[in-house]
Amino acid sequence: AIQVTVPDPYHVVILFQPVTLHCTYQMSNTLTAPIVIWKYKSFCRDRVADAFSPASVDNQLNAQLAAGNPGYNPYVECQDSVRTVRVVATKQGNAVTLGDYYQGRRITITGNADLTFEQTAWGDSGVYYCSVVSAQDLDGNNEAYAELIVLGRTSEAPELLPGFRAGPLED
């Protein structure tokens, strides 16, 4: 079996700044080098919009749902059919392949399984799933996710998103 862990599941970054989404894994055996697949899924709800209207009816409903199910995350838990899903990058051995949508972007998988954006862009906000599979169990469900929010330089949103912390601001 393969155990996949994302040690820091929340990231807030300023537009055009770099960010690395860390992912680690442990394998019980090494049949062949594992395949690392990073997938992007759009948020089920707009996190930034909710941050600016915390008293909305929807947010109150979400709070009630979360109270009944402490593990419920309304931004992440919805069917793929109602959101955008893309392969960001895959890594097999030392070869990294970008998904079609990300061709030309300065994105790579560094280390064993970390996803690195040299420069974030509008549209990068969402949920990133790190999946690690063996060559002979490609459909294995061994994944963990990180949420990424990309904010404009003038936004005050980082202060309004409890549980998130902004990454270093670099020029």
Partner: antibody, heavy 115, light 106 residues
């Protein structure tokens, strides 16, 4: 040595159900996706269904979707195919196969669906 | 469905290449295997899996490669006992897919 032994084939009646079992040995069973592939007489190979190593994910070919169920018991190193509402076109040799891109095959078990 | 030539022929000692195309990617990559069937109804034997991996009991004259969505099986120094049907298979989002097979006559 890797071995995959299928059982459960034979003469079946249309509309009935069959249960095929594949017993695996010689490898770390839970690390491999397992597949069922069939071959009708005089025809090519047809993928039927597959199940991930943990058993958490299953997929089915269009010809059997809604009629087939694949399951596995990692403790017993077995994978089972249940196929309901049998049709004449389900006739053929059913192979158990190891891996996402298959690296080992069983000897096959023949299934005949006929009145 | 996967596309491969219906038949190829070669003399012993020659190099044979069989191509397979039409597969779809799975999570951004392509995954192919090659299977040898010596007679109808006999169990297939894997000669290449995971694009270019060869099972330990398969002779080194068999090799596999991929370029984009096309896979190639190469038999370097083909032998009479290699005469068989070679079937390519791939792994994609919808499940497994096989080609109709290529009959190799030596």
């Amino acid at each position: 040595a890797v071995t995959l032994d299928e059982s459960g084939g034979g003469l079946q009646t249309p509309g009935g159900a069959l249960s095929l079992v594949c017993k695996a040995s010689g490898f770390d069973f839970s690390s491999y996706e397992m597949q069922w592939v069939r071959q009708a007489p005089g025809k090519g190979l047809e993928w039927v269904t597959g199940i991930s190593g943990s058993g958490s994910s299953t997929r089915y070919g269009s010809a059997v979707k809604g009629r087939a169920t694949i399951s596995r018991d990692n403790g017993q190193s077995t994978v089972r195919l249940q196929l309901n509402n049998l049709r004449a076109e389900d006739t053929g040799t059913y192979y158990c196969a190891r891996g996402s891109t298959i690296d080992a095959w069983g000897h096959g078990t023949e299934v005949t669906v006929s009145t | 469905a996967l596309t491969q030539p219906a038949s190829v022929s070669a003399n012993p000692g020659e190099t044979v290449k069989i191509t397979c195309s039409g597969g779809s990617s799975y999570a951004g990559s392509y995954y192919y295997g090659w299977y040898q069937q010596k007679s109808p109804g006999s169990a297939p034997v894997t000669v290449i899996y995971y694009n270019d991996q060869r099972p330990s009991d398969i002779p080194s004259r068999f090799s596999g490669s991929t370029s984009g969505s096309t896979a190639t099986l190469t038999i370097t120094g083909v032998q009479v006992e290699d005469e068989a049907v070679y079937i390519c298979g791939t792994y994609e989002d919808s499940g497994g897919v096989f080609g109709a097979g290529t009959t190799l006559t030596v």
